[in-house]
């Protein structure tokens, strides 16, 4: 009988140890959850505040209305310029209006002076039509002033306050454009 009681007591003690372990695990898990919750809240808070403080354009880009512009500091041929813009999630500049043209030429004067800058304009080899990179036609006031005599592909560039044309394989600076981030506050 005594042996039976002692066995039951040992079993109960074993159960108690297991429960204590489970409780300890639970407490540890709860503490870990609380820590994770704190971390998540802090992370969300940081994300929200950084989103709140973030500017509509990346560093070294210029904003005008809904667009951000990047004026390159390197020369490249037209096709490589396009690639360089794509790397940044942008395309070569597409000038939609005289107001945008004025802003660009005004900004260039302040930044660098009178250099050549590739834009996203090229001339179709067959039809001779000028088209922006998305396939749209430039407005009549925004056609390159001089027709290039090049037998090769011809692309558009900005110089001073004019839109001009040149062999796409010549080296120039370039301007990229992307949409400005809309502020939600």
């Amino acid at each position: 009988k005594l042996l039976q009681v002692s066995t039951i007591a040992m079993q109960q003690q074993e159960k108690l140890i297991q429960q204590e372990r489970a409780l300890l695990n639970f407490t540890e898990w709860k503490r870990s959850c609380a820590l994770q919750m704190k971390y998540c809240q802090a992370f969300m808070q940081n994300s929200l505040s950084s989103a709140h403080n973030s500017s509509p354009c990346p560093n070294n880009w210029i904003q005008n209305r809904e667009s951000c512009y990047y004026v390159s500091e390197i020369w490249s041929i037209w096709h490589t310029s396009q690639e360089n813009c794509l790397k940044e999630g942008s395309t070569l500049l597409q000038i939609e209006s005289k107001e945008e043209m004025d802003f660009i030429t005004g900004s260039l004067r302040k930044i660098k002076g009178s250099y050549d800058y590739w834009v996203g304009l090229s001339q179709d080899g067959h039809s001779g039509r000028w088209l922006w990179q998305d396939g749209s036609s430039p407005s009549p006031g925004l056609l390159p002033a001089e027709r290039s005599q090049s037998a090769n592909q011809v692309c558009g560039y900005v110089k001073s306050n004019s839109l001009l044309s040149s062999n796409c394989s010549t080296w120039k600076y370039f301007i990229c454009e992307k949409y400005a981030l809309r502020s939600s506050v």
């Epitope: 794509l86 999630g89 395309t91 396939g135």
Partner: nanobody
């Protein structure tokens, strides 16, 4: 790392249409733009069309008005709808993804346009 898988190539008659797909996997959050290149035999690889994550597009002159690039952000997939195909569109079409640091290429899909 970004992995790209193209599909949709094939043989089509001149004037016909094809739709190419390129599915990206891996570090897709780092992609800034995706696009299509093509390479015909004995020719250099050329950019056909590209689209940025903002939806800005760029096309090679000879495909403007015939090809349309689009994307499905949720599926991390880019499509190239090719209409009014010409024999000179015959090439291997490669998908490319641009990140700020690196460029990634797919293995390519063959498009053949017969006259």
């Amino acid at each position: 790392q970004v992995q790209l898988q193209e599909s949709g190539g094939g043989l089509v008659q001149a004037g016909g249409s094809l739709r190419l797909s390129c599915a990206a996997s891996g570090s897709v959050f780092s992609i800034n733009a995706m696009g299509w290149y093509r390479q015909a035999p004995e020719k250099q690889r050329e950019l056909v069309a590209a689209i940025t994550t903002q939806g800005r597009t760029t096309y090679e002159d000879s495909v403007k008005g015939r090809f349309t690039i689009s994307r499905d952000g949720a599926q991390n997939t880019v499509y190239l709808q090719m209409d009014s195909l010409k024999p000179e569109d015959t090439a291997v079409y490669y998908c490319k993804a641009w990140t700020a640091k690196d460029d990634y290429w797919g293995k390519g899909t063959q498009v053949t346009v017969s006259s």
